[in-house]
């Protein structure tokens, strides 16, 4: 509770609080928190957890205050909630609370972890689903492919991940994904680690010639979710084997990229 | 903050090789892919490729294929670019950039690259 | 490749001026995917690296001043400074950022009178 002083909810309903430009947001950001009641109001307050008195004040005769907080830095995140009150109550009392807000102020979101579903082996002619998972809802996340330019899905998620779609036949490819919040001015996450997803028996030595590192063939552009590598017709495949990149040396296999591009 | 730094200008004779460097600051180095573009005096951008530090995957364009080899050191947050069997039309300012899912959002500095003999 | 075609090559005006420079490129730079255009403009100005203006052919990058506009789809793109101070004198580069290799135009240089 904010103060012993809380009215009933329904006697004093609570305001609405939001953040422009977004409650996420990267250090050095001029960051506007609105304080809207649903009556005018007299003073609005702006608290944070724990604290009896607001951490700022406004005092306007409107429905709306603006808290500005300037060129945030990571200390300023944490949560906020703002009160109204009007003169005709009593010393001390507040309206109900806001819902809270959550201020991040972050260089980069945290790495998202990025892994297939439902399992590892996936058989023949069966689709890939992959997982992009972050910590944050509401985020715009990105699956790349190693070796394509243009982003291969692109998905925004009221949940904290995304799942991508690859066709079984096209899925071969290294995959790797981003998130980020879903309007300008950006915060990015940092890159996820990298997904192999290959035949199943495939290594350096069943590795086709055709598609060397760098070769490609006329294919799906990039924007296709099941962008295709070069044929592998003489190969039979059992199924998909998923798995995280190794370490290893530019002499040792990596998938080609995808004949993604006509140009290329 | 972010800060690519270069390493600096290199003069080398014809058919000699250069390698210069570019040490990464201020973010997770492998979190980015690491472009390489040329610029000849006077002259407007060539991109040359770039690599994935966390792999060490690389994409050449294929102008550059057997002239630039690129690589990376995840334990010195630092790429490299070697460029070989030098002519006067590698004389050029050489720069890396981190790529973010945006664009090439921080370049360094440039490494001048002088072919004389 | 795809190749970026950018017109003027050089353009002298006055401060205050508004600006429009051309880009076009030989293939769609159009993403279905997230139907986002992969085309990014650059600023460099003598003796610096190139700095990102806008990305995405429209959204402005971090920092940058809204005097500068992006539009344009597909292959047909436009740079716009709305009213060009002294500080804006430099080339301007468009870039095809879907697919690789990566290709840059010829720029445009923006001189002051």
């Known amino acids: 509770d904010i103060t012993p002083s809380v009215p009933p909810a329904s006697y004093h309903p609570k305001p609405w609080l939001g953040a422009q430009p977004a409650t996420v947001v990267t250090p050095g950001v001029n960051v506007t928190l609105r304080c809207r009641a649903p009556q005018p109001a007299w003073r609005f307050g702006l608290f944070k957890p724990g604290e009896i008195a607001p951490l700022l004040f406004r005092d306007v005769s409107s429905e709306l205050a603006e808290f500005f907080l300037e060129e945030v830095t990571p200390a300023q995140g944490g949560i906020y909630r703002c009160c109204y009150r009007r003169p005709d109550w009593g010393p001390g009392v507040w309206s109900q609370p806001s819902d809270v807000l959550e201020l991040l102020v972050t260089e980069e979101l945290p790495r998202p972890s990025l892994v297939a579903l439902p399992g590892p082996v996936v058989g023949p002619g069966a689709n890939v689903s992959l997982r992009c998972a972050g910590r944050l809802r509401n985020m715009s996340f990105v699956l790349y492919r190693e070796g394509v330019a243009a982003p291969l899905q692109y998905r925004h998620s009221a949940q904290p991940w995304a799942d991508f779609t690859l066709l079984g036949a096209r899925a071969p490819g290294t995959y790797s994904c981003y998130y980020h919040t879903p309007s300008a001015p950006y915060v990015l996450s940092q890159r996820s680690e990298v997904l192999v997803i290959s035949w199943e028996g495939e290594g350096p030595e069943a590795r086709p010639a055709s598609s060397a590192p760098g070769m490609q063939a006329p294919g799906p552009p990039p924007s296709d979710p099941g962008a295709q590598a070069p044929s592998l017709s003489s190969f039979r495949p059992r199924g998909l084997v998923l798995q995280p990149l190794l370490p290893q040396t530019q002499d040792s296999w990596d998938p080609a990229p995808p004949p993604s591009d006509p140009g290329v | 903050q972010v800060q690519l730094q270069q390493s600096g200008a290199e003069l080398a004779k014809p058919g000699a090789s250069v390698k210069m460097s570019c040490k990464a600051s201020?973010?997770?180095?492998?979190?980015?892919?690491m472009h390489w573009v040329k610029q000849r005096p006077g002259q407007g951008l060539e991109w040359i490729g770039y690599i994935n530090p966390s792999t060490d995957y690389t994409e050449y364009n294929q102008k550059f294929k057997d002239k630039a080899t690129l690589t990376a050191d995840k334990s010195s947050s630092t790429a490299y670019m070697q460029l070989s069997s030098l002519t006067s039309e590698d004389s050029a300012v050489y720069y890396c950039?981190?790529?973010?899912?945006?664009?090439?959002?921080?370049w360094g500095q440039g490494t001048s690259v002088t072919v004389s003999s | 490749d795809i190749v970026m075609t950018q017109s003027p090559s050089s353009l002298t005006v006055t401060a205050g001026e508004k600006v429009t420079m051309s880009c076009k490129s030989s293939?769609?730079?159009?993403?279905?995917?997230?139907?986002?255009?992969?085309l990014t403009w650059y600023q460099q100005k003598p003796g610096q690296p190139p700095k990102v203006l806008i990305y995405w052919a429209s959204t402005r990058e971090s920092g940058v001043p809204d005097r500068f506009t992006g539009s344009g789809s597909g292959t047909d793109f436009t740079l716009t400074i709305s009213s060009v101070q002294a500080e804006d004198l430099a080339v301007y580069y468009c870039q095809n950022d879907y697919s690789y290799p990566l290709t840059f135009g010829t720029g445009t240089k923006l001189e002051l009178k």
């Open positions: 293939q769609s730079l159009l993403n279905s995917g997230n139907q986002k255009n992969y």
């Open positions: 950039a981190r790529r973010s899912p945006f664009a090439m959002d921080y």
């Open positions: 201020g973010f997770t180095f492998t979190s980015y892919w």
